[in-house]
């Protein structure tokens, strides 16, 4: 029961086009050490949405300060949502490895659906 869980509380989120979407994710433990990443889709063809460790993701902001000591909240907000952003988003914890980090555990996934922009 003490093993880390990746908690994605919402099964679905619906957002109007042009708005921002908040995708919630939290860890129940700081161990193991390693980054978290957000992906759209699962399996080999999944698309990287955010990498805590590196990269430039101009539309993504973190809801809390990820560098803050003992932070367990890895929720993100994606700005200017379009219909192309629809899909299932997974918050994934990686274990620090050498040379590469290893996937440790994934959240259950949050389906993002996009509504037409209100006229």
């Amino acid at each position: 029961e003490d093993e880390l869980q990746v908690i994605q509380p919402e099964k679905s989120v619906s957002v109007a086009a042009g708005e921002s979407a908040t995708l919630r994710c939290a860890m129940t433990s700081l161990i193991p050490v390693g980054p978290i990443m957000w992906f759209r889709g699962a399996g080999a063809g999944r698309e990287l949405i955010y990498n805590q460790k590196e990269g430039h993701f101009p539309r993504v902001t973190t809801v809390s300060e990820l560098t803050k000591r003992n932070n367990l909240d890895f929720s993100i907000s994606i700005s200017n949502i379009t219909p192309a952003d629809a899909g299932t988003y997974y918050c994934v914890k990686f274990r620090k490895g050498s040379p590469d980090d290893v996937e440790f555990k994934s959240g259950a996934g949050t389906e993002l659906s996009v509504r037409a922009k209100p006229s």
Epitope: E1, D2, Q5, V6, I7, Q8, P9, K11, S12, R24, A26, T28, L72, D73, T88, K105, S106, G107, A108, G109, E111
Partner: antibody, heavy 123, light 112 residues
Framework: QVQLVQSGAEVKKPGSSVKVSCKAS????????ISWVRQAPGQGLEWMGS????????NYAQKFQGRVTITADESTSTAYMELSSLRSEDTAVYYC????????????????WGRGTLVTVSS | DIVMTQSPLSLPVTPGEPASISCRSS???????????LDWYLQKPGQSPQLLIF???NRASGVPDRFSGSGSGTDFTLKISRVEAEDVGVYYC?????????FGGGTKVEIK
């Protein structure tokens, strides 16, 4: 053996508030969500809202929005449900229920229920 | 809100005979992660509800194997292969696919 221990029965006047507690005895909340479900006499089950202590925020059924507040104290493994502006139709047994988190399925079911707290609203 | 419709409302049963309860949802309960967010609970007289079946077809810990759940999407069934006297009470289906969580109206199972 973890149990959800609820506070005792209450009799309240219309217009007043009631606060019911639910303590996880023999365990912690960790990754659980706690929901509140009520049952009016002879009626079915009605979900009121839930809280995930790790996030600290609650979500509520539209019907109760603005009248119910669900909170949790992780240090004592206790959840609370406060219902305000009570009316006779709020007379019911109020249950707390625990939803475990499955790593691949998320929150999907209530595996443990409290014994219920009867709240009677009467003038 | 997702509306849950159970049938029948009342089910008189003979011990040793099978029984079946149907539950329909107004929207699909199947998530893209492959899970059906449909659970079955039994509330025995004077008691709290207890979990029987979760995520469509998984028997909860301690639940006898005479109980089984099946279905996907919008149509689900709870089956009791051989009813016992201790199975009397009100059976509820519940969806946790969307918010708010909603319950069926209940099926009262009683011995003939």
């Amino acid at each position: 053996q973890v149990q959800l221990v609820q506070s005792g029965a209450e009799v309240k006047k219309p217009g007043s508030s009631v606060k019911v507690s639910c303590k996880a005895s023999g365990g912690t909340f960790s990754s659980y969500a706690i929901s509140w479900v009520r049952q009016a006499p002879g009626q079915g089950l009605e979900w009121m809202g839930s809280i995930i202590p790790i996030f600290g925020t609650a979500n509520y059924a539209q019907k109760f929005q603005g009248r119910v507040t669900i909170t949790a104290d992780e240090s004592t493994s206790t959840a609370y449900m406060e219902l305000s502006s009570l009316r006779s139709e709020d007379t019911a047994v109020y249950y707390c229920a625990r939803a475990p988190y499955g790593s691949s399925s998320g929150y999907g079911y209530f595996d443990l229920w409290g014994r219920g707290t009867l709240v009677t609203v009467s003038s | 809100d997702i509306v849950m419709t159970q049938s029948p409302l009342s089910l008189p049963v003979t011990p040793g005979e099978p029984a079946s309860i149907s539950c329909r949802s107004s929207q699909s309960l199947l998530h893209s992660n492959g899970y059906n967010y449909l659970d079955w609970y039994l509330q025995k007289p004077g008691q709290s509800p207890q979990l029987l079946i979760f995520l469509g077809s998984n028997r909860a810990s301690g639940v006898p194997d005479r109980f089984s759940g099946s279905g996907s999407g919008t149509d689900f069934t709870l089956k009791i292969s051989r009813v016992e006297a201790e199975d009397v009470g009100v059976y509820y289906c519940m969806q946790a696919r969307g918010s708010p969580i909603t319950f069926g109206g209940g099926t009262k199972v009683e011995i003939k």
